[in-house]
């Protein structure tokens, strides 16, 4: 059985300020069991953008129903984009663990750039 891959098909996405940005992510397998998270940045200081398991993320919606059986699409949409949202976003798969989930594999990242709002 092939090991799970995290696919972020777009290397970059450009969005006008005030619009929503869709960041695409897909898994190639349901195994291992565990949540996905979206981060901005890849280092120790990375910012949590969305956690499938818990948290409050008012500007983030999932493109498909994540709880649906056999779902492999973990794309998100971020509303009301501003220049402060620019950066590289990573979709990361975690393996269920005890007491803490363990990072399993990351997508290659999608760079979000923000254009000035059209006048």
């Amino acid at each position: 059985e092939d090991e799970l891959q995290v696919i972020q098909p777009e290397k970059s996405v450009s969005v006008a300020a005030g619009e929503s940005a869709t960041l695409r992510c897909a898994m190639t397998s349901l195994i291992p069991v565990g949540p996905i998270m979206w981060f901005r940045g890849a280092g120790a200081g990375r910012e949590l953008i969305y956690n499938q398991k818990e948290g409050h993320f008012p500007r983030v919606t999932t493109v498909s129903e994540l709880t649906k059986r056999n779902n492999l699409d973990f794309s998100i949409s971020i509303s009301n984009i501003t220049p402060a949202d620019a950066g590289t976003y990573y979709c990361v798969k975690f393996r269920k663990g005890s007491p803490d989930d363990v990072e399993f594999k990351s997508g290659a990242g999608t760079e979000l750039s923000v254009r000035a709002k059209p006048s």
């Epitope: 998270m37 981060f39 901005r40 940045g41 890849a42 280092g43 120790a44 200081g45 990375r46 910012e47 949590l48 953008i49 948290g55 409050h56 950066g87 803490d100 989930d101 990072e103």
Partner: antibody
């Protein structure tokens, strides 16, 4: 408005322990990595420790094995447990929020730790 | 581990003059350099990041330049509130986070 308020500093003897706290407000605490940075009297800034959003911890070599960083997201609070304190740990300890691109964008006012016999 | 060396240690200038502060990295760091200002008894404040980008609310008399190993913070027309200590920081992805030793800009 983002606010970081440190507490728990004081005067201790070498070898003793102290626990610092940092109460955070004005942002979604659980979504950001948090740090302790210190400044000895009349000296520059020295990064001490970071705890990531997934609770991974990092330490400066000078405090490794003696200090422990932790966070309680339900209380929006960051902690630093300092054991086996030394005179060279004397400093103002700042709590600082770090951004995804490794910038310290918000700082507390600091709490003074003095280690003296 | 990268070392950031700031010079001069102290800069004595009068209000209205231009301040030029240097930060040198021991190895190339692209443009991942930030500058902070610290006034006595206060916490540091982010001024500039990615070498040239001013943080929110920072006046345009502050500007950054450089690349690779040599970086400069320039303060045009010093105001009384600009007399402070300035630190550079390497914006590296992983700890330890490195700060320079600081440059004090004092009133002549």
């Amino acid at each position: 408005d983002v606010q970081l308020v440190e507490s728990g500093g004081g005067v201790v003897r070498p070898g003793e322990s102290l626990r610092l706290s940092c109460a955070a407000s004005g942002f979604t605490f659980s979504n950001f990595a948090m740090n302790w940075v210190r400044q000895a009297p009349g000296e520059g800034l020295e990064w001490v420790s970071l705890i990531s959003v997934t609770a991974t911890t990092y330490y400066a070599d000078s405090v490794k094995g003696r200090f422990t960083i932790s966070r309680d997201n339900s209380k929006n609070t960051l902690y630093l447990q300092m054991n086996s304190l030394r005179a060279e740990d004397t400093a103002v300890y700042y709590c600082a929020k770090v951004t995804w691109n490794n910038l310290f964008d918000y700082w507390g006012l600091g709490t003074l730790v003095t280690v003296s016999s | 581990e990268i070392v950031l060396t700031q010079s001069p240690g102290t800069l004595s200038l009068s209000p209205g003059e231009r301040a030029t502060l240097s930060c040198r990295a021991s190895q190339p760091i692209d443009s991942y350099l930030a500058w902070y200002q610290q006034k006595p008894g206060q916490a540091p404040r982010l001024l500039i990041y990615n070498t040239v980008t001013r943080a929110t609310g920072i006046p345009d008399r502050f500007s950054g330049s450089g690349s690779g190993t040599d970086f400069t913070l320039t303060i045009n027309r010093l105001e009384p509130e600009d007399f402070a200590v300035y630190y550079c920081q390497h914006q590296y992805d992983w700890p330890p986070y490195i700060f320079g030793g600081g440059t004090k800009v004092e009133i002549k």
